[in-house]
Interface confidence: low
């Protein structure tokens, strides 16, 4: 109610004579802070002095503390809150009751504490879960009601006496609710453990040895079983017997059933310790193991593997990898059952034996075509030899071999001709499926591995072609090698290097690019006149009458080709000069009279100049001089001269006659 | 003059997959195949593939089947390479080439760089 | 399937000198070899196919030979322009089309 002080502690404290006690412990006063602390040893309230009497183990006042034996109390509170208090070290006669008389300046409290103390270190207490089972794990727990700040202790587990590997974790508690040291093992039982000590020993801090408790572990688990077997390899041949017998060597709780099985599988009707095999075959081969069960479950033995012997069965091969491809590597297992395995193999390729060839195995590192065929083995083991089973079929796949491109046509080839070519093979696998052609025209094929090339061009010069199944094989390539008429036939002027004039030497050139067969003959023409046969056409001393149009013709087996006309052009000074008279040489006086220069020049006459009789320039210079009105004075012989580029000609004199006209006649 | 124009760079991400396109022109497209050939950092040419322009007719690395795909399109000029289910090797330059016995055209080349 | 097998992997080469670049296949090739060259950051470049044969605007010092399972590259001045990595590469069989895995021609 309102009127008590209200205190929190432990209600007993328990240790041992020459340890420590610590007792943890809170209080709030009714009204104000705590003024008088006395701790008394078994107080007893005296009615006449209305005070308490008893052993004062611990005092303090408002004046200060009175010292306590050899402070061997220790008051560890304060004045509103915290009573906790230590004895250090705690005897015998320390048990019983403490009273903790409490004053403020108004109230009083005693409030009664239980301190056991015994003459030996008490042991700690093993709590066990209610079953055990092997190899399910458990907590084992050891406790003990004492924790001191002052005395540290420890708990050590022990299994037969010997520390025990586990981890254990140790936990201690000195609170008002409760003071004790704990310790946890998590520890997974097996079926050995049954029956087995287990200790949990209290030490002090240095390792000796305080006290203990022991437990005796009962560890529930199935029936843990022995298997003999007679004969003890439990090798035998078909016909042999076999006895197998099944001990029991620990089971809790007690087994209640026995069975055998074979392989996993459980053995009908045989539900004795003894299994009994009479005339075995080697079928009867395999794991045998006997099962026993009690309430946790069953147990098993472990497996005998028995060994039925017997000749080797008819063997299969079995390929690594078909098909297989050419070069690539190839392994054969020869698979026979047998026991024991077989020692011994002999191989077979097509029927016939494979020398050198005795191993389970047999690689080939390099596979070529001829490797194709059908592979059987047989197998051999010391009870006798097997028989040669179907065999398997190794496939070996390689390119096309030996691919060759091959002209149909008649040779040779002409430019222009439908060129048939096929491309051939001498061997595949798998079969050609398609073939390339290089270079990759936009060509006709007709037929598989057939090229038709229409109107074959004259620089159409090798072909390849590949045949292809998985991979293509390239044929060396053919030159078609085709045949044409010369190409590109040009005239060429050798010399003169510069423009030809008349008297020059001259040399002309029929040049062409190229022409198969190389074999040519040349034709020079001028005006359809066949001028010579040579691939030059020389001129010592050109002439006029030289120049004109030109061409060359070059022909081979295949066809000819002429040049484009090539004109001839020669620059010489004006020549045949004449003067001609219009409209005659004897003109009446008073007309007109015109004197026309007539030349033959190259480059044509750029400049003109007239002559008289007396050789007098005229003060004319165009190709005409025009007289009029014409005078008989004008009568006389003239002359003109022409000039070009290349140099000057002259004419002869021509004689105009002037005659009087009739009017002047008839005047004189 | 003949030409082979590759697309440009592409960066990627494992798994992913990219298409490179390599455009022809200066002779006629159909009557020359395509090869592809790849080049890794510092590493040796390695032959990809081949497709005739003329039938479409394609021949792949084994070592590429089932991730290469190699087209053309005959009204564009063009042909395309696509490699699926990208790795960080096939980080490499690409290229397009003109195919003949005689002489060849490479593209520039396109970086393909694959990287988580 | 087929393995070309390049040697030397490097080769030290002044300018001016002879190099020679061997590829030996697994099988026989026939004469289906070609060779290519390859500078940093280009495509690579053919130089020789059918085993001898220039290709289009290849310099005449570049000159192929061999046959059947043994082949040469021989380059016959190198030029500055020559430093670069070879590769041989087989079209006999395939797929796959294989290549050598290269012989690097570097400055001496």
């Known amino acids: 109610d309102s009127s008590k002080w209200v205190f929190e502690h432990p209600e007993t404290l328990y240790a041992w004579e020459g340890a420590c006690v610590w007792i943890p412990c809170t209080y709030r006063a009714l009204d104000g802070d705590l003024e008088s602390f006395i701790l008394f040893h078994n107080p007893e309230y005296n009615k006449n002095t209305s005070k308490f009497d008893g052993t004062r183990l611990y005092e303090s006042t408002k004046d200060g503390k009175v010292p306590s034996e050899q402070k061997r109390v220790q008051f560890l509170g304060d004045k509103n809150k915290n009573c906790t208090l230590s004895i250090h070290p705690v005897h015998l006669n320390d048990s019983g009751q403490l009273g903790l008389r409490m004053e403020s300046k108004t109230e009083k409290w005693m409030e009664r504490i239980h301190l056991n103390v015994s003459e030996r270190p008490f042991p700690p207490h093993i709590q066990l879960p209610p079953e055990i089972q092997e190899s399910q794990e458990v907590t084992l727990t050891c406790l003990l009601n004492f924790s001191c700040y002052g005395y540290p202790i420890q708990l050590q587990w022990l299994l037969e006496g010997v520390p025990m590997r586990q981890a254990a974790v140790t936990s201690t508690s000195l609170t008002i609710k409760s003071v004790f040291t704990r310790s946890e093992l998590k520890f997974s039982p097996q079926w050995s453990h049954h029956g087995k000590i287990v200790t949990c020993q209290l030490q002090d801090a240095d390792g000796k040895f305080l006290s203990n408790d022991t437990v005796q572990l009962n560890v529930k688990h199935t029936p843990k079983l022995e298997i003999k077997v007679t004969p003890s390899d439990a090798i035998v041949r078909e016909g042999d017997s076999v006895t197998m017998t099944c001990e029991v060597s620990s089971s809790n709780p007690e087994y209640t059933t026995v069975s055998w099985l074979k392989d996993g599988t459980s053995l009908k009707k045989q539900n004795t310790f003894t299994l009994n095999l009479r005339e075995v075959t080697k079928d009867q081969s395999g794991k045998y193991c006997c099962q026993v069960s009690n309430d946790v479950g069953p147990g098993r033995s472990e497996e005998v593997f028995l060994q039925v012997q017997y000749a080797p069965e008819p063997s299969t091969v079995q390929i690594l990898h078909s098909p297989a491809v050419e070069g690539s590597q190839v392994e054969f297992l020869c698979m026979s059952l047998a026991n024991p395995l077989p020692t011994n193999y002999t191989w077979y390729h097509n029927g016939k034996e494979m020398q050198g060839r005795t191993e389970e195995k047999v690689h080939i590192p390099k596979i070529l075509p001829w490797h194709a065929g059908t592979y059987s083995c047989v197998a051999e083991n010391i009870l006798g030899t097997g028989q040669r089973g179907p065999g398997a079929e190794l496939d070996v796949q390689y390119p096309p071999k030996k691919v060759t491109t091959v002209i149909q046509n008649p040779m040779p080839i002409r430019e222009g001709d439908t060129v048939t070519l096929s491309c051939n093979y001498n061997s595949s696998n798998p079969s050609v499926t398609r073939y390339e052609w290089k270079p990759h025209g936009a060509w006709e094929e007709p037929s598989l591995g057939v090229l038709k090339i229409q109107n074959v061009g004259w620089d159409n010069t090798t072909i390849a072609c590949a045949a292809c199944n998985s991979w293509c094989s390239w044929a060396s390539p053919v030159a078609l090698n085709v045949q044409y008429a010369p190409r590109d036939v040009r005239v060429r002027k050798i010399k003169p290097l510069s423009e030809i004039h008349s008297g020059n030497s001259v040399s002309l050139q029929c040049d062409f690019s190229s022409s198969h067969p190389k074999e040519v003959q040349f034709f020079w023409e001028k005006n359809g006149r066949l001028l010579g046969k040579e691939s030059q056409l020389n001129f010592d001393s050109i002439s006029p009458e030289d120049a004109g149009s030109y061409s060359c013709w070059v022909n081979n087996s295949i066809g000819q080709t002429a040049s484009k006309a090539w004109t001839l052009e020669v620059l010489y000074a004006p020549r045949r000069l004449r003067v001609s008279m219009s409209p005659g040489d004897q003109v009446m006086e008073g007309k007109s009279a015109t004197l026309t220069c007539e030349s033959d020049a190259n480059p044509p006459v750029s400049h003109y100049t007239w002559f008289d009789w007396n050789n007098q320039s005229l003060p004319y210079h165009s190709q005409k001089l025009r007289l009029e009105p014409v005078k008989v004075q004008h009568s006389g012989a003239y002359w003109c001269q022409g000039t070009n580029s290349v140099g000057k000609g002259r004419s002869p004199l021509s004689t105009l006659t002037v005659y009087y006209s009739p009017e002047t006649i008839g005047r004189r | 003059q003949v030409q082979l124009v590759q697309s440009g760079a592409e960066v990627k991400k494992p798994g992913a997959s990219v298409k490179v396109s390599c455009k022809a022109s200066?002779?006629?497209?159909?009557?020359?195949?395509i090869t592809w050939v790849r080049q890794a950092p510092g590493q040796c040419l390695e032959w990809m593939g081949w497709i005739s322009a003329y039938n479409g007719n394609t021949i792949y690395a084994q070592k590429l089947q089932g991730r290469v795909t190699m087209t053309t399109d005959t009204s564009t000029s063009t042909a395309y390479m696509e490699l699926r289910s990208l790795r960080s090797d096939d980080t490499a330059v690409y290229y397009c080439v003109r195919d003949s016995n005689h002489e060849d055209f490479w593209g520039q080349g396109t970086l393909v760089t694959v990287s988580s | 399937e087929i393995v070309l097998t390049q040697s030397p992997a490097t080769l030290s080469v002044s300018p001016g000198e002879r190099a020679t670049l061997s590829c030996r296949a697994s099988?026989?090739?026939?004469?289906?070899l070609a060779w290519y060259q390859q500078k940093p950051g280009q495509a690579p470049r053919l130089l020789i196919y059918g085993a001898s044969t220039r290709a289009t605007g290849i310099p005449a010092r570049f000159s192929g030979s061999g046959s059947g399972t043994e082949f040469t590259l021989t380059i016959s001045s190198l030029q500055s322009e020559d430093f670069a990595v070879y590769y041989c590469q087989q079209y006999h069989t395939w797929p796959p089309v294989t290549f050598g895995c290269g012989t690097k021609v570097e400055i001496k």
């Open positions: 200066g002779y006629s497209f159909t009557s020359y195949g």
């Open positions: 099988q026989s090739v026939s004469s289906n």
